[in-house]
Interface confidence: low
């Protein structure tokens, strides 16, 4: 768990291809929009840490949230930072600590209650890697009991998969996740081929649906397996 | 390539109004908030407005509140500022911008001149 | 509404470091965010969250926090270095954005 408040660019210094492109010379703007990057966080030199990759924040501990270490996200590998501590830049909730959320782009105490006017009822609520995304930043939702209990339809913000509605998923569109169309017979899949690569989709599908499963198109020939079509296939 | 293009600025007498547009591409405008910044000849940079990804929420800088209006079209990708009761300090190069740190980007500029 | 004050202007010659200055009121519970501006071009983000630096960034920029005072550090300027810098946080308690008044940086 990267718990210590140290030096900030330890993990641009990492091997590649953790740190590979962490210091590329670029332009300010990059091809992909706004991956996220570790922003005020500081990192613990130990010889033998290990960066843990994940694909999506569920997947880190409670004081971890999952992004590119890179502000451009050129790695193209996305792995468990420490979370943001109160006052710092944020895109979404999950990368703050725990006890606090991210408002307007800065980590705030969830028992924080300065809120005025109009926005009293508002919350910065994650995207992907926004302020709420890599596209990610900052979705601000109606905070009622409706957020909580209401499954989210097609195109609802979430989470994880049980915030969707039956038939539908979490998953990423750019650096935001949202609920999606659980795949049905017959429509392209992506066939991970190691654990962790579906952190590196910008437009992530879903999964198969019950009784289907993700296998390359019997007809589909190309000239290497690599590129071959998956689809989903009665079992 | 993440894009922000300024456009609408031009010489304009003071008490007359201005609209300036800013077109987004590259990236998912409905996903960001999205602010304006001016710089005056001479002066320094100075924020101006603040409007939430999907138009719920909107701040002005005490110059100019009462004054401009800044709105957006998510289905345009597009931010406006509605400048009315133009004054002679308003005159500023125009910037929008995310201002979001990992995502910090700034159109070039569109010059707004408010002269008799 | 909160206020950065920033000194107009800070010389330096080439190859030395040149420290500029932000101070506002507890300004070390705030993030502070730097910008550089030359003539006609917009804005550049140098310095993110205290003292964090895009990876496009010079490692010869740096910043601190602490107190009433932010400070951006350029060591080994160069002449290309010459121009505007702006300190910038968000003042949450107004929604407001708030920019330093700029200091003009000068290589002798």
């Known amino acids: 768990t990267l718990n210590s408040v140290l030096n900030s660019n330890a993990i641009k210094n990492l091997p590649p291809p953790l740190g590979g492109a962490a210091g590329h010379p670029g332009s300010a703007v990059s091809a992909a929009p706004g991956i996220l990057y570790p922003g005020g966080n500081k990192y613990q030199t130990i010889d033998n840490y290990q960066p843990y990759p994940c694909a999506e924040d569920e997947e880190c501990g409670t004081d971890e949230y999952c992004a590119s270490p890179t502000r451009g996200g050129d790695a193209g590998v996305q792995i468990c930072l420490a979370c943001r501590k109160r006052r710092k830049r944020c895109m979404r909730h999950a990368m703050c600590c725990p006890g606090n959320y991210c408002k307007n782009g800065i980590c705030v105490s969830s028992d924080q209650n300065h809120f005025r006017g109009e926005i009293e009822e508002t919350i910065t609520e994650s995207f992907g890697n926004d302020h709420s995304t890599l596209d990610g930043y900052s979705r601000r939702t109606t905070l009622s009991s409706k957020m909580y209990h209401t499954k989210g339809q097609e195109g609802s913000v979430c989470l994880r998969s049980s915030d969707c509605a039956s038939g539908l998923c979490c998953a990423r569109h750019f650096w935001s996740k949202i609920c999606k169309p659980v795949l049905k017979e017959g429509q392209v899949c992506t066939k991970h081929r190691r654990k962790g690569s579906h952190g590196l989709e910008i437009f992530q599908r879903c999964y198969c649906g019950e009784g289907l499963s993700c296998r390359i198109q019997k007809d589909h020939h190309q000239a290497s397996n690599s590129s071959r079509l998956h689809t989903c296939q009665r079992h | 390539q993440v894009q922000l293009v300024e456009s609408g600025g031009g010489v304009v007498q003071p008490g007359r109004s201005l609209r300036l547009s800013c077109a987004a591409s590259?990236?998912?405008?409905?996903?960001?908030?999205m602010h304006w910044v001016r710089k005056a000849p001479g002066k320094g940079l100075e924020w101006v407005a603040i409007?939430?990804?999907?138009?719920?929420?909107?701040y002005y800088a005490d110059p100019v509140k009462g004054r401009f209006t800044i709105s957006r079209d998510n289905s345009k990708n597009t931010l406006y500022l509605q400048m009315n009761s133009l004054r002679a300090e308003d005159t500023a190069v125009y910037y929008c911008?995310?201002?979001?740190?990992?995502?910090?980007?700034w159109g070039q500029g569109t010059l707004v001149t408010v002269s008799s | 509404s909160y206020v950065l004050t920033q000194p107009p202007s800070v010389s330096v010659a080439p190859g030395q470091t040149a420290r500029i200055t932000c101070g506002g009121n507890?300004?070390?519970?705030?993030?502070v965010h730097w910008y550089q501006e030359k003539p006609g071009q917009a804005p550049v983000l140098v310095v993110y969250?205290?003292?964090d630096r895009p990876s496009e960034i010079p490692e010869r920029f740096s910043g601190s926090n602490s107190g009433n005072t932010a400070t951006l550090t350029i060591s080994r300027v160069e002449a290309g270095d010459e121009a505007d810098y702006y300190c910038?946080?968000?003042?949450?308690?107004?929604?407001?954005?708030?920019f330093g008044g700029g200091t003009r940086l000068t290589v002798l």
């Open positions: 911008a995310t201002l979001a740190a990992a995502f910090d980007y």
């Open positions: 590259g990236f998912t405008f409905s996903r960001y908030d």
């Open positions: 409007i939430f990804y999907d138009g719920s929420n909107k």
């Open positions: 507890n300004i070390g519970s705030k993030s």
């Open positions: 969250d205290d003292s």
């Open positions: 910038q946080v968000w003042d949450s308690s107004s929604d407001h954005v708030v």
